[in-house]
Amino acid sequence: ELCLYDPPEVPNATFKALSYKNGTILNCECKRGFRRLKELVYMRCLGNSWSSNCQCTSNSHDKSRKQVTAQLEHQKEQQTTTDMQKPTQSMHQENLTGHCREPPPWKHEDSKRIYHFVEGQSVHYECIPGYKALQRGPAISICKMKCGKTGWTQPQLTCVDEREHHRFLASEESQGSRNSSPESETSCPITTTDFPQPTETTAMTETFVLTMEYK
């Protein structure tokens, strides 16, 4: 089952999947002036490889492209990388059966990757450079099914401007000693949910992240 909504935003942080679960979809998006081949609308993680390779061809008319496919129109876009420079995946890729690695870039690829995650997917959070990580628990969010709905758990990470770190020493000590209560996995509350409420915005892009870098 596809996850509704995006992984939660953590101010001044970025998230990344170390590997992608079977069924994950990546839109074939092309940069301005290029369009995807009609038959290559998206890539899907099948087993531990991607079903096809995205391709972009020159588009002299520069027609506006649909952001999502008809099959996925009802799903919210889930973007995990940047609007101006894709962060490079480094070292930590898991190689598990039923999981795919980060697909290699394709020629004329859009700077923003739009993923559609599936239940059970986890994403790892890190503070963007310039921000110090204050961690109270795992900096991970997992898409879980609860009471018939998918939602993301809240990562235990706060990012503070490193240039102001002297102002945060007291709060860092108190946050470090605080234990975050584990989520209730069994009960289904009538009016509330363990999942953070989805926001109107999609997952944080690096444009936003970097604009916020020293704010």
Partner: antibody, heavy 114, light 107 residues
Framework: EVQLVESGGGLVQPGRSLKLSCAAS????????MAWVRQAPTKGLEWVAS????????YYRDSVKGRFTISRDNAKCTLYLQMDSLRSEDTATYYC???????WGQGTLVTVSS | DIVMTQSPTSMSISVGDRVTMNCKAS??????VDWYQQKTGQSPKLLIY???NRYTGVPDRFTGSGSGTDFTFTIRNMQAEDLAVYYC?????????FGSGTKLEIK
């Protein structure tokens, strides 16, 4: 006291490789993003690369993309810059800094010349 | 890439002077500009971050202002130990870019 100590610089021929290290102490290394900045002789400062606190995301200037690799070993409190296919224009003093540039090392000189 | 145009390139000043230098970004960078001091033979030091915030331990004679594309750095009551090259840097988007520097020299 925060300390960043670079090492690994030296004279290298064009096309060859060099790996710089930056040993960090006096702060919780794994909580901080890190960066490399270089300065060619008598020139200004030029950002080279940055890495997030856990090493998942890396960022590079275009002229070094595909040739340089920034990485880190949080267990050893060390930042690295692997430099391949070096060019004469890479000649510079390379500084290691925290991601917000509040702390800098003393720099290590890399000279690329035949 | 965002180009940071710094002016002037150099200035001849006297102790006690008020020194002002400027940085102009080629596009809007909000308040994401920092100022650094680099003395001969030393590594750079952060003085001002986010356009106007003085970093810990930096004397209050150093001030910064501006937002959007135009930024100003001022040294009030210039001291001999302030002789250095000063750089602005935009931290709004990658690639991070520095100005070319302003060198302060004694008259």
């Amino acid at each position: 006291e925060v300390q960043l100590v670079e090492s690994g610089g030296g004279l290298v021929q064009p096309g060859r490789s060099l790996k710089l290290s930056c040993a960090a102490s006096g702060f919780t290394f794994s909580d901080y993003g890190m960066a490399w900045v270089r300065q060619a002789p008598t020139k200004g400062l030029e950002w080279v690369a940055s890495i997030t606190n856990g090493g998942l995301n890396t960022y590079y200037r275009d002229s070094v993309k595909g040739r340089f690799t920034i990485s880190r070993d949080n267990a050893k409190c060390t930042l690295y810059l692997q430099m391949d296919s070096l060019r004469s224009e890479d000649t510079a003093t390379y500084y290691c800094a925290t991601g917000g540039f509040s702390f800098w090392g003393q720099g290590t000189l890399v000279t690329v010349s035949s | 890439d965002i180009v940071m145009t710094q002016s002037p390139t150099s200035m001849s000043i006297s102790v006690g002077d008020r020194v002002t230098m400027n940085c102009k970004a080629s596009q809007n960078v909000d308040s994401n500009v920092d100022w650094y001091q680099q003395k001969t033979g030393q590594s750079p030091k952060l003085l001002i971050y986010k356009a106007s915030n003085r970093y810990t331990g930096v004397p209050d004679r150093f001030t910064g202002s501006g937002s959007g594309t135009d930024f100003t750095f001022t040294i009030r009551n210039m001291q001999a130990e302030d002789l250095a090259v000063y750089y602005c840097m935009q931290s709004n988007s990658y690639p991070l870019t520095f100005g070319s520097g302003t060198k302060l020299e004694i008259k």
